[in-house]
């Protein structure tokens, strides 16, 4: 069984599946569509890598900037590095700039809804 | 002004292969993915794969797997379609398509290559 | 693969009358999340490279005319050239844009009657 019909078997449990299994399914090659992924729950989407969401979306990554105005693709871009956005050839703008260094402060980051971050 | 610049026409033998180019200007080339879509003499269109200029990652249709590399150069701003083991079923024009999001928003002029033996 | 089907094959319409193309696919192309139907529209006259016209099933393109407009959701999808033009003499596509591979409907030629 090739990635797409794994996927495809699995599609339905999605939905609240936890970030380790993300990144698991990320090494499968499924490509996963681009509606799929925005059902998932952001709190597991956003300590995804853009590595690994390449590798989850496949070829439908390049629809996260169609859909960068919603979530939880626009919660996941601002905790992403801008270089590393930039690999992603779309022109994604709202990264964290380079030399910041990002402080996983759970208790802020939940109140704020977006990562504290430390400049250069 | 977007534009893509296709090569020209190429006739080919079966068993061939065949390099069509696109270089892209008026936009920056690494912002957006290229396609490549074919279409077959008084035919429809079909979408042959996609490319991330920025990285060099390519995806392609599964009919087409076996046969098809996309690459870039992006020191030209031109993205390459190379098809090999030609046969006269591929006879077609093959167009780049600069991507929008998902849709193709810009157009080449399309590149008819003639499989003949 | 999602299997996009076209209808009419071809429509013959009086210059300044209506046109409707209808476009089905073989399976949702709605993101319930966004909202967005993945469907485009382009339009391919005689000799010419395909254009965009329309793309999230309505949303029209840029330097497009407003007698062409999308409509349709979910499977269902249709464009209407509100009052018909010699211009618009040419072969309209559907694509879906939801799942790789990405596929077209057969086309529908518009000409004059």
């Known amino acids: 069984m090739n990635g797409s019909e794994y996927f495809v078997k699995i599609q339905s449990f999605l939905g609240g599946a936890p970030t380790e299994d993300l990144k698991a399914l990320s090494q499968q090659n499924v490509s996963m569509d681009l509606a799929t992924f925005m059902k998932l729950r952001t709190d597991a989407v956003l300590p995804l890598t853009v590595a690994e969401v390449q590798k989850l979306l496949g070829p439908h990554v390049e629809g996260l900037k169609a859909e960068e105005r919603h979530r939880p693709v626009r919660d996941w871009i601002l905790r992403q590095r801008q270089d590393d956005l930039d690999t992603l050839g779309l022109g994604l703008q709202g990264g964290i700039p380079n030399g910041y260094l990002v402080l996983d402060l759970s208790m802020q980051e939940a109140l704020s809804g977006t990562p504290c971050l430390l400049g250069p | 002004e977007v534009q893509l610049v296709q090569s020209g026409a190429e006739v080919k033998k079966p068993g061939a292969s065949v390099k069509v180019s696109c270089k892209a200007s008026?936009?920056?080339?690494?912002?957006?993915?290229m396609h490549w879509v074919r279409q077959a003499p008084g035919q429809g269109l079909e979408w042959m794969g996609n490319i991330n200029p920025s990285s060099g990652d390519s995806y392609y249709n599964e009919r087409f797997m076996s046969r098809v590399t996309m690459t870039v150069d992006k020191s030209t701003s031109t993205a390459y379609m190379e098809l090999s083991s030609l046969r006269s079923e591929d006879t077609a024009v093959y167009y780049c398509a600069r991507s929008g999001g998902l849709w193709l928003a810009f157009w080449g002029q399309g590149t008819l290559v003639t499989v003949s033996s | 693969d999602i299997v996009m089907t076209q209808s009419p094959d071809s429509l013959a319409v009086s210059l300044g009358e209506r046109a409707t193309i209808n476009c089905k696919s073989s399976?949702?192309?709605?993101?319930?999340?966004?909202?967005?139907?993945?469907l485009a529209w382009y339009q391919q006259k005689p000799g010419q490279s395909p254009k965009l016209l329309i793309y999230?099933?309505?949303t029209r393109e840029s330097g497009v005319p407003d007698r062409f407009s999308g409509s349709g959701s979910g499977t269902d999808f249709t464009l209407t050239i509100s009052s018909l033009q010699a211009e618009d003499v040419a072969v309209y596509y559907c694509?879906?844009?939801?799942?790789?591979?990405?596929?077209f409907g057969g086309g529908t030629k518009v000409e004059i009657k």
């Open positions: 399976q949702t192309l709605l993101n319930s999340v966004s909202q967005n139907n993945y």
């Open positions: 694509q879906q844009h939801y799942r790789t591979p990405y596929t």
């Open positions: 999230f099933a309505s």
């Open positions: 008026g936009y920056t080339f690494t912002n957006y993915w």
